[in-house]
């Protein structure tokens, strides 16, 4: 099941996804795709990073945070109703079946009023993040602005899946830890 995020037509949408690099610059490849996460990779890739930089992006999709510190949250500029749907954030930790994948549901609502769309640079207040602490603790809600509709049970389920993953084995080598968007 997916965590749900909301935005209005004409706004910028924010879909959070995080990991903690072993050290600054020791990046893990990440891909964002439109549609639920497939078995491997991302389908309909809209943005991707490699171990050094953003290596693929498409119009209106960008990383607002510091991806070199593991903030790979996706911003979609000036959304339309067509942007509604499931998005996949996949943290591509090297190894067999080692990726961490998160499905985030974006719901676009018609604008209440229709002023000229404004580009917003500080998305944290408008779209508060849902995190788990290193993928293990209970979900923490930052109640800044209007909260997206988030099911805490779903967050806990995702956290449990993280605990079940093979990530722990990779920590010896890369030190990467995951936090849920």
């Amino acid at each position: 099941s997916e965590v749900e995020y909301r935005a209005e037509v004409g706004q910028n949408a924010y879909l959070p996804c995080f990991y903690t690099p072993a050290a600054p610059g020791n990046l893990v490849p990440v891909c964002w795709g439109k549609g639920a996460c497939p078995v491997f990779e991302c389908g309909n890739v809209v943005l991707a990073t490699d171990e050094r930089d953003v290596n693929y992006w498409t119009s209106r999709y960008w990383l607002n945070g510091d991806f070199r510190k593991g903030d790979v949250s996706l911003t979609i500029e000036n959304v339309t109703l067509a942007d509604s749907g499931i998005y996949c954030c996949r943290i591509q930790i090297p190894g067999i079946m080692n990726d961490e994948k998160f499905n985030l549901k974006l719901v676009i609502k018609p604008a209440k009023v229709t002023p000229a769309p404004t580009r917003q640079r500080d998305f944290t207040a408008a779209f508060p993040r849902m995190l788990t602490t290193r993928g293990h603790g209970p979900a923490e809600t930052q109640t800044l602005g209007s909260l997206p509709d988030i099911n805490l049970t779903q967050i806990s389920t995702l956290a449990n899946e993280l605990r079940d993953s093979r990530l722990a084995n990779d920590l010896r080598d890369s030190g990467a830890t995951i936090r849920i968007g």
Epitope: F40, I96, M97, D164, S165, N169
Partner: antibody
Framework: QVQLQQSGGGLVQPGGSLRLSCAAS????????MSWVRQAPGKGLEWVSG????????YNADSVKGRFTISRDNSKNTLFLQMNSLRAEDTAVYYC???????????WGQGTLVTVSS | EIVMTQSPDSLAVSLGERATINCKSS????????????LAWYQQKPGQPPKLLIY???TRESGVPNRFSGSGSGTDFTLTISSLQAEDVAVYYC?????????FGQGTKVEIK
């Protein structure tokens, strides 16, 4: 020592089903991801399916997606592969394999032959 | 998915001579954060399951004779048998475990000349 004992292979008609089992001993199954790898007669190795230690995450090759299901019973230290809608091209020796730390296959079962033919 | 290509397909070497098998990946399997190449080598004798020989490109599995060695980085890798013995007759496979589905080379058959 680590052992993987396989069973369940045999001859089946196209469209039929089989269930392979892999009984593990010498290690705690729930601590490791596991996989099935197959080898068609006279051919190379092809990864088929994998499962996380808890059984919460499963992965399948495109060639078997929607037809094969990997599962495990950690209480019985046993790995399974349920194969449905079998095709002639599924004919192969199937190996269960233990995955060391998300990386390589460090132990393999003895293999079991699955023949799909009318 | 990452495609692994081995060469040659078969190799005939005299006893005591060196055998060299090459493996090329369609993309790099080197993870710069830990400077490890996610590549393993397996040996398969007729009628037997594969046996892990080498992992992380060059680390020998316990019990594997030191005449087996692995080298390479990025996309190009080599398995070397320094002095071929009769019991080394087998098919050898490389395998990447860097990303996507784990994939194997097509295999190299080593025989005695």
């Amino acid at each position: 020592q680590v052992q993987l004992q396989q069973s369940g292979g045999g001859l089946v008609q196209p469209g039929g089903s089989l269930r392979l089992s892999c009984a593990a001993s010498g290690f705690t199954l729930s601590s490791y991801a596991m996989s099935w790898v197959r080898q068609a007669p006279g051919k190379g190795l092809e990864w088929v399916s994998g499962i996380s230690g808890s059984g919460g995450s499963t992965y399948n090759a495109d060639s078997v997606k929607g037809r094969f299901t990997i599962s495990r019973d950690n209480s019985k230290n046993t790995l399974f592969l349920q194969m449905n809608s079998l095709r002639a091209e599924d004919t192969a020796v199937y190996y269960c394999a233990k995955i060391f730390g998300s990386y390589y296959f460090d132990y393999w079962g003895q293999g079991t032959l699955v023949t799909v033919s009318s | 998915e990452i495609v692994m290509t081995q060469s040659p397909d078969s190799l005939a070497v005299s006893l005591g001579e060196r055998a060299t098998i090459n493996c090329k990946s369609s993309q790099s399997v080197l993870y710069s954060s830990n400077n490890k190449n996610y590549l393993a080598w397996y040996q398969q004798k007729p009628g037997q399951p594969p046996k892990l020989l080498i992992y992380w490109t060059s680390t020998r599995e316990s019990g594997v004779p030191n005449r087996f060695s692995g080298s390479g980085s990025g996309t190009d890798f080599t398995l070397t048998i320094s002095s071929l013995q009769a019991e080394d007759v087998a098919v050898y496979y490389c395998q990447q475990y860097y990303s996507g589905p784990p994939t194997f080379g097509q295999g190299t058959k080593v025989e005695i000349k």
